[in-house]
């Protein structure tokens, strides 16, 4: 015998107490398959979450995060800050990268500057706390007589020793 | 039964002070940051600043540093939000969340229903 549930389309539950009729899904809340015998409850987007997709009879809702936090996890179950450019979140929030890294982004930790002299070449355009260094041709590409393009070493930034 | 509630909202006029309050209940305080946040109307919701569980503060946005400052009462189960030199700008709806850490808030994080902090020019 085909069981009578299995009649009931996405956005309806097979409802035991009024026969197995299939009916509709309460409001906040979804059947996002056929065949169900309950309903799920809707996701809310609260707090530092907002609503990119609002919950319908078939599918939960979506959410993001508000300016300021990005997601991370599946479907968004989590808000981290944002930092700017030249930091990195830390357990005590966001630090500055120590001289000789940099972050280009606003989430991810600070990465060392590319060394130039490992791959032969020198160094075109100094690093800073954003950005990488921008490394030149090797010193064998110059033409004779042509003077270095690497300039000296960069002082130390106050406020931006290695911690 | 887990709550946040908010209070001390209202109407101030501009360069006035105001303190506002999360009182919190159902759940293990001392273990919890408490980050507030605000939306204005036909803005987006935006973080203002939240303090940790062993009480240092971050600090969500610039615009309020050297104006707002957070601070928490254990024996109370609150956290105070005092608001100075308040602007129009600061008009919104404030509340409170309940995140494990400031940097970090999940989707089963506890959140009061908010307090309207008006400012008038």
């Known amino acids: 015998l085909q069981d009578p549930c299995s009649n009931c389309p996405a956005g309806t539950f097979c409802d035991n107490n009024r026969n197995q009729i299939c009916s509709p899904c309460p409001p906040n809340s979804f059947s996002s398959a056929g065949g169900q015998r309950t309903c799920d409850i809707c996701r809310q987007c609260k707090g530092v979450f907002r609503t990119r997709k609002e919950c319908s009879s078939t599918s939960n809702a979506e959410c993001d995060c508000t300016p300021g936090f990005h997601c991370l996890g599946a479907g968004c179950s989590m808000c981290e800050q944002d930092c700017k450019q030249g930091q990195e979140l830390t357990k005590k929030g966001c630090k500055d990268c120590c001289f000789g890294t940099f972050n280009d982004q606003k989430r991810g930790i600070c990465r060392p500057w590319t060394n130039c002299s490992l791959d032969g070449k020198s160094v075109l355009v100094n690093g800073t706390k954003e950005r990488d260094v921008v490394c030149g041709p090797s010193p064998a590409d110059l033409s004779p007589g042509a003077s270095s393009v690497t300039p000296p070493a960069p002082a130390r930034e106050p406020g931006h020793s290695p911690q | 039964q887990v709550q946040l509630q908010e209070s001390g909202g209202g109407l101030v006029q501009a360069g006035g002070s105001l303190r506002l309050s999360c009182a919190a209940s159902?759940?293990?305080?001392?273990?919890?940051?408490i980050g507030w946040f605000r939306q204005a109307p036909g803005k987006e919701r935006e973080g203002v600043l939240c303090?940790?569980?062993?009480?240092?503060?971050?600090y969500y946005a610039d615009s309020v540093k050297g104006r707002f400052t957070i601070s928490r009462d254990n024996a109370k189960n609150t956290v105070y939000l005092q608001m100075t030199n308040l602007k129009p700008e600061d008009t919104a709806v404030y509340l409170c969340g309940a995140p494990r850490d400031c940097s970090r808030y999940s989707s089963d994080d506890y959140w009061g229903q908010g307090t309207q902090v008006t400012v008038s020019s």
């Open positions: 159902g759940f293990t305080f001392d273990d919890y940051a």
């Open positions: 303090i940790s569980s062993s009480g240092g503060s971050t």
